[in-house]
């Protein structure tokens, strides 16, 4: 639990930018939580660099991260989930840089899954449903979801709908007929916990039907 590097220590190391960011995932593996950190500069030479978290832990002072390629990772049950922890980049037992972070404010939910779209001919709409593992969790239960969809040919023209449930209805009249659409969804904590958007779910593709004219209706 050493403090910050003193002036004159590790002179070469101090020339580098050791800025880093982290995200937590709660109950990601049963009752185990995880914390993942990475350097913001992908070119940082991570040889001999270690990450350590101290404080706001259950019955231990500090925990060391495991290194997996360019990311640093902890899986544990020992997060108090209140107050700030001190997360430090260390070399040879000396801290190069530290950040005080409340792990409940950097939560990244798991990506939604089982996204599907069903067309209801009678209702002239599309029912979008998806699933999230967070419905079964004790902590990060309340999420805001972002459903994004686009016509496949419009590469950057995404439409977004925010919702708190896992079901959305898209009206046929608001979509182009006889078109291929791509749809995907992601989630962010929305109560007590704060943090980041999850990864996107795998995309689902669906085609809209052609417009059926009502009997007696004339083509223009």
């Amino acid at each position: 639990e050493s403090g910050y590097a003193q002036n004159g220590d590790l002179e070469d190391a101090e020339l580098d930018d050791y800025s880093f960011s982290c995200y937590s995932q709660l109950e990601v593996n049963g009752s185990q939580h995880s914390l993942t950190c990475a350097f913001e500069d992908p070119d940082v030479n991570t040889t001999n660099l270690e990450f350590e978290i101290c404080g706001a832990l259950v019955e231990v002072k500090c925990l060391s991260f495991r290194k997996l390629q360019e990311i640093y990772f902890i899986e544990t049950k020992k997060f108090l989930l209140i107050g700030k922890s001190n997360i430090c980049v260390k070399v040879g037992g000396k801290s190069l840089t530290c950040k005080k972070i409340d792990l409940t404010t950097i939560v990244k939910p798991e990506a939604p899954f089982d996204l599907s779209v069903i067309y209801r001919e009678g209702a002239n709409d599309f029912v979008v449903t998806f699933n999230t593992s967070h419905l079964q969790k004790k902590y990060v239960k309340v999420l805001m979801h972002d459903v994004a969809y686009r016509q496949e040919k419009d590469e950057n023209k995404w439409m977004h709908v925010n919702l708190s449930s896992t079901k959305l209805t898209l009206l046929q009249r608001n979509l182009q007929p006889e078109a291929m659409y791509e749809i995907k969804v992601r989630s962010i904590p929305d109560h007590y916990f704060k943090g980041f958007w999850s990864e996107w779910s795998p995309s689902y593709y669906f085609r809209t039907p052609e417009i059926n004219n009502s009997p007696g209706e004339m083509d223009p």
């Epitope: 639990e1 050493s2 403090g3 101290c54 404080g55 706001a56 832990l57 259950v58 019955e59 231990v60 002072k61 500090c62 108090l80 989930l81 209140i82 107050g83 700030k84 001190n86 005080k100 409340d102 004790k138 902590y139 007590y192």
Partner: antibody, heavy 119, light 105 residues
Amino acid sequence: QVQLVQSGAEVKKPGASVKVSCKASGYTFTGYTMNWVRQAPGQGLEWMGLINPYNGVTSYNQKFKGRVTLTRDTSISTAYMELSRLRSDDTAVYYCARGDGNYWYFDVWGQGTTVTVSS
Amino acid sequence: EIVLTQSPATLSLSPGERATLSCSASSSVTYMHWYQQKPGQAPRPLIYEISKLASGIPARFSGSGSGTDFTLTISSLEPEDFAVYYCQEWNYPYTFGGGTKVEIK
């Protein structure tokens, strides 16, 4: 104002248990840890354990683990400390103290509860 | 477990004098806090995170140090400053030092 009010003095026999309460007011109870610190007559301060009122997660000083149990009732913003298998050297003043989670110091203290263990 | 040793155990000074209290840790500590306790009262926070003044604490109190050696200084003792002072490490198991009693000479 922020306040912690503890239950009254207790006299117990060796081998018995004692349960001390600490009622919080003036702040969001679930936003801070509740710590328990004891002080034997003429002695220094000794941290016993803490509870996160939001989720009930506890962290104990190994010296007391197995003998101390921390609980809380969020509906009445009250924390409890139960110490079992009492011995004469458990005679002390027991304090609850709010933990400031930004800096991990005890920023608000209860008035203390005197527990006397005597046969 | 880190052991915090406070010295001196007792400091006999007169009002208006400067008091320097030491807290030595058996291994490196990132942050240290200080509390004041008067007879029959609960402790009250004085200094947190080495040098930050707790709410309502007068500026004659200051803290400094790093690593294993920390100091609480009272620049000019007032009559109400005669009490016992404790240092405490910020991390589990939140160990306190044995205390320094500042008494009137």
